[in-house]
């Protein structure tokens, strides 16, 4: 049961963000998940290293990962999915999932590649009037749903308020997605829903929208967030653009 | 030197609670299980549950359960059982020890306190 | 998951070669240990993974098997190896050792 031979998924991700790493087999069998070891392999000669372990109900995160990663798959379901919180630089790499099924001695294997991005700007500049886009992206090797997107703002006047809205109802397979309150008209979604983007594009931007803007995916019970703190500067002075504008004329004496 | 130090010898009422420590010395007490086994000449060595300091999980032997609840500190890197109800088949020695992570669902004790 | 573990005493000389095996009730997929108890102390790791040599022991300590067939074999028995056997299966909870083989000096 050996996936590692085909070539395995590829992550990209930056520091501080999350990653979830697919670890899902088919069975033919109703038989369920016994233990489940992750490993990384950092490769450049470097030792491997410890992850997580799991077995008889008990979820061990390893040294270095503890309190950063956990299992989200469900267990009883056949998913050893493992997702990895405040991802760093050292945690470049593949990650190798090895699933075992009790009376079984065969080991069912699946390679992730982890690649790690320096860390985004979680500060953007932005002019009055100007347009502006805040990215939210998890990644995830998972095609899971996303349940809902909500961006939140809190601005200057402690009060939170809703910027933007997605739903999507599984059962009814009903979108919906929203833009509220003095963000109405003004935000839009550019991120592929499919693809677990969630960002949006603020335009018109105003002076009261320097903030805090916390994103959050909900991707069934799991949930990523993400805080932005967007500046907003004055408007830029719009000076009309002539030739006599872009050259300075030194005038005589005679001269109006 | 890795070394897990065990409370002394201690004598108690039939019904009694006791509580017995072990502690952790030259290694990072929240990456490794803490196992608790109980030797008798009749039974020998009998595998009373794990707890994991890191994550707080425990496991318990089913023939245990009620009998040994397993606590640790980790402020002071130091496991505890405390066994109740106690009575004479519960007089024997006790032992802590250290279960390594060896890869690949492999586990095995490589540190034990005295006992 | 019980483990049966013979013989339950035996007397060898030095230089002699010992072999203790150990019956597991099911297959444990090589998830199997040795340890050596010496009188009035706690067990010591001489075997884990059914095979491997844990660091320190003597390469005298050899270890075999799989499914549910293992066992312990000292190439030459010295003085110091006079002591009490344990194998322990580690592939499922509850943990169970054997009863134990006390090995004693001819």
């Known amino acids: 049961l050996n996936d590692l031979n085909v070539s395995p998924p590829e992550l990209t991700v930056h520091v501080g963000d999350s990653a979830l790493m697919g670890c899902v087999f088919q069975s033919t069998e109703d038989k369920c998940i016994f233990k489940i070891d992750w490993t990384l392999s950092p490769g450049e000669h470097a030792k491997d290293e410890y992850v997580l372990y799991y077995y008889s109900n008990l979820s061990v995160p390893i040294g270095r990962f503890q309190n950063r990663v956990h299992l989200m798959g469900d267990i009883l379901c056949n998913d050893g999915s493992l997702l990895l919180q405040d991802v760093q630089e050292a945690d470049q790499g593949t990650y190798i999932c090895e699933i075992r099924l009790k009376g079984e001695s065969q080991v069912f294997k699946k390679a992730v590649v982890l690649h790690v991005l320096p860390e985004e700007p979680k500060e953007l500049m932005v002019h009055v009037g100007g347009l502006i886009q805040m990215g939210c992206v998890f990644q995830s090797t998972e095609v899971k749903h996303v349940t809902k997107v909500e961006w939140i703002f809190s601005g200057r006047r402690a009060k939170e308020e809703i910027v933007f809205r997605y739903y999507h109802k599984l059962r009814m397979s009903v979108e919906y997605s929203q833009s509220w309150g003095h963000f109405q008209n003004r935000v839009n979604l550019v991120g592929d829903i499919f693809r677990n983007d969630g960002s949006i594009m603020l335009q018109g931007v105003r002076e009261s929208d320097g903030g805090n803007y916390t994103c959050s995916i909900h991707l069934g019970n799991l949930v990523f967030k993400k805080t932005i703190v967007l500046h907003v500067s004055p408007e830029e002075p719009r000076t009309l653009v002539t030739p006599a504008a872009l050259r300075p004329l030194v005038l005589g004496g005679n001269q109006l | 030197d890795v070394q897990l130090v065990e409370s002394g010898a201690e004598l108690v009422r039939p019904g009694a609670s006791v509580k017995l420590s072990c502690k952790a010395l030259a290694y990072t007490f929240t990456d490794y299980e803490m196992h608790w086994v109980k030797q008798t000449p009749v039974h020998g060595l009998e595998w009373i549950g794990i707890?994991?300091?890191?994550?707080?999980?425990?496991v318990y032997n089913q023939k245990f359960k009620g009998k040994a609840t397993l606590t640790a500190d980790k402020s002071s890197s130091t496991a505890y059982m405390e066994l109740s109800s106690l009575t004479s088949e519960d007089s024997t020695v006790y032992y802590c020890?250290?279960?390594?992570?060896?890869?690949?669902?492999?586990?095995?004790?490589?540190?034990w306190g005295a006992g | 998951m019980v483990l049966t573990q013979s013989p339950a005493s035996l007397a060898a000389s030095v230089g002699e070669t010992v072999t203790i095996t150990c019956r597991a009730s099911e297959n444990i997929y090589y998830s199997l240990a040795w340890y050596q108890q010496k009188q009035g102390k706690s067990p010591q790791l001489l075997i884990y993974n059914a095979n491997s040599l844990e660091d320190g022991v003597p390469s005298r300590f050899s270890g075999s098997g799989s499914g549910t067939q293992y066992s312990l074999k000292i190439n030459s028995m010295q003085p110091e190896d006079t002591a009490t056997y344990f194998c322990?299966?580690?592939?499922?909870?509850?943990?169970?050792f054997g009863a134990g083989t006390k090995l004693e000096l001819d």
């Open positions: 322990e299966q580690t592939y499922d909870v509850p943990l169970t």
């Open positions: 707890i994991h300091p890191g994550s707080g999980g425990t």
């Open positions: 020890t250290r279960r390594r992570y060896y890869g690949s669902s492999y586990w095995y004790f490589d540190v």
